[in-house]
Amino acid sequence: LTCLGGFASPGPVPPSTALRELIEELVNITQNQKAPLCNGSMVWSINLTAGMYCAALESLINVSGCSAIEKTQRMLSGFCPHKVSAGQFSSLHVRDTKIEVAQFVKDLLLHLKKLFREGQFN
């Protein structure tokens, strides 16, 4: 019964699966990009190290009305242990340059692919 219960109500998604799905979504965004992504909106670039997922969400959550990245925003929130609101930046987030969302997505995708290859799923 316990096992069946597990099947009936899916448990947490394994980190490797969640990361793969995020990578797939970012690939989808970059490949399907026709017009400039999010009208060329600019967001704060991030340091792709500690706290990367929360920092990425802190940057992207400020962009509203861009359906192309809404799924990415939701997926990133699953990687970030705390709630992130628009206009909120942690001490880890150094605001030194803004880049277009399209470039942000490309940079994030390259880094996540590297993490996946190295088996770093968290």
Epitope: N39, S41, N62, G65
Partner: nanobody, 116 residues
């Protein structure tokens, strides 16, 4: 409808100064972060500077740090960019932008040409 109207550009010699202005309407200006973005001939868009809603938080691209100053007057719904020690590489069309909305609401921009 959001409207942004830039002005103040022109031809200036290297080492000279200009002050750009941007008149904003159609939204509650004092509630939003604002950006200056530029586009040099034949190049992509480049972020220049940002300012927080209250005006106390300011940020600059390394290429303009120490030379440009961003400011705002929320009572006049106006954004400014004071540009000093201008260089040939600062030649571009300058746009003001409501942060995170992209060029959907950009104005026509104002051309800054730095040349002797």
């Amino acid at each position: 409808e959001v409207q942004l109207l830039e002005s103040g550009g022109g031809l200036v010699q290297p080492g000279g100064s200009l002050r750009l202005s941007c008149a904003a309407s159609g939204f509650t200006f004092r509630d939003y972060e604002m950006d200056w973005v530029r586009q040099a001939p034949g190049k992509g868009r480049e972020w220049v500077s940002s300012i927080g809603p209250g005006g106390s938080e300011t940020y600059y691209a390394d290429s303009v740090k120490g030379r440009f100053t961003i400011s705002r007057d929320n009572s006049k719904n106006t954004l400014y960019l004071q540009m000093n020690s201008l260089r040939a590489e600062d030649t571009a069309v300058y746009y003001c932008a409501k942060a995170y909305t992209g060029f959907k609401y950009w104005g026509q921009g104002t051309l800054v040409t730095v040349s002797s």
